[in-house]
């Protein structure tokens, strides 16, 4: 039975040129994470952080992606491009999996705050 | 020049045990993670598992879970790989092959290892 | 665990033809696909990894493709020194799985 859940950061924002952290948390399962894999909404691959290996950045992201904190991923470089859907898939065992969903949008405006938050889905 | 330099060829009885190294030289041992990979006579091949020399942390194939022990000796650069309760279907040649920097493909390999298990 | 099915396990080609060897995952794994080739009494080389990048020093001749459950790996004009056994492999999850492997023959 998976009684786990997802704190993501939500919907966020930050400015173009800038970077901001994705950042998903696993609470309320004794499950051993085994990997964690960071998606884009059109199912690309970030990066995959395994958890006794490390990570695998992926070549399209290697220059603008920068691991952590933690399980989280920092992405840099921020274009307009780049809004949009960021998914946090938690392998665990023996749950199974877990999937958080985070929503970046990236402002023009140079006064743009970067807002995040910890929600529940 | 990266290179891995695996020990010499094994013949052993049913039942040993036996220790594989894998001498690196060429990069900074610590920073890229080190595999294993068998391959059988004529076929595929199988990811047994993985190490991170930084910290020791190891990653398993299910399958070989309490048949192969993976560890380093960051003072030599080297890996090993403990097989045991050897049987004929242990009969093949073992690979250790270096991850490349983060990344989870294999980038240099090393010449091999042929383990022969006979009575 | 992830199944890694190269249907054809031997291909037979000509010098200078154009071959693919294709790949099927049983899931979806993204682009968390990797291709080696290993030449008879060697051990494998990496020749394409994240399903479509060259590794340094390999070829132009030789591209990957691919995402999802379905990959191809092209040799545009195969010559002489390509006869070898090529491998997919996933690293989506553990544990990490490879395909059957195909063995390109030249006529």
């Known amino acids: 039975m998976m009684t786990g859940t997802i704190e993501t950061t939500g919907n966020i924002s930050a400015k173009k040129g800038g970077s901001v952290i994705l950042q998903c948390h696993l609470s309320s399962t004794m499950a051993q994470v085994t990997q964690v894999n960071w998606e884009q909404h059109d199912h690309s691959l970030l990066a995959i952080r395994n958890a006794e290996l490390g990570w695998h950045i992926y070549p399209a992201f290697k220059d603008r992606v920068a691991p952590g904190p933690g399980l989280g991923l920092t992405l840099q470089s921020l274009t307009m491009n780049d809004t949009g859907e960021y998914f946090c898939t938690y392998h665990t065992y023996p749950d199974g999996t877990y999937r958080g969903r985070i929503f970046l949008e990236v402002l023009e405006s140079s006064v743009a705050e970067h807002s995040a938050r910890f929600q529940i889905p | 020049e990266v290179q891995l330099q695996q020990s010499g060829p094994e013949l052993v009885k049913p039942g040993a045990s036996v220790k594989i190294s894998c001498k690196t030289s060429g990069y900074t041992f610590t920073e890229y993670t080190m595999h294993w990979v068998k391959q059988s006579h004529g076929k595929s091949l199988e990811w047994i598992g993985g190490?991170?020399?930084?910290?020791?942390?190891?990653s398993y194939n299910q399958k070989f879970k309490g048949k192969a022990t993976l560890t380093v000796d960051k003072s030599s650069s080297t890996a090993y790989m403990e097989l045991r309760s050897l049987t004929s279907e242990d009969s093949a040649v073992y690979y250790c092959?270096?991850?490349?920097?983060?990344?989870?493909?294999?980038?240099?390999w090393g010449q091999g290892t042929t383990l022969t298990v006979s009575s | 665990d992830i199944v890694m099915t190269q249907s054809h396990k031997f291909m037979s080609t000509s010098v200078g033809d154009r071959v693919s060897i294709t790949c099927k995952a049983s899931q979806d794994v993204r682009t968390a696909v990797v291709w080696y080739q290993q030449k008879p009494g060697q051990s494998p080389k990496l020749l394409i990894y994240?399903?479509?990048y060259r590794y340094t020093g390999v070829p132009d001749r030789f591209t990957g493709s691919g995402s999802g459950t379905d990959f191809t790996f092209t040799i545009s004009s195969v010559q002489a020194e390509d006869l070898a056994v090529y491998y997919c492999?996933?690293?989506?999850?553990?544990?990490?799985?490879f395909g059957g492997g195909t063995k390109l023959e030249i006529k």
């Open positions: 092959a270096r991850g490349a920097y983060y990344r989870y493909d294999f980038d240099y």
């Open positions: 994240s399903a479509s």
């Open positions: 492999q996933q690293h989506y999850s553990t544990p990490w799985t």
């Open positions: 190490i991170n020399p930084n910290n020791g942390g190891t």
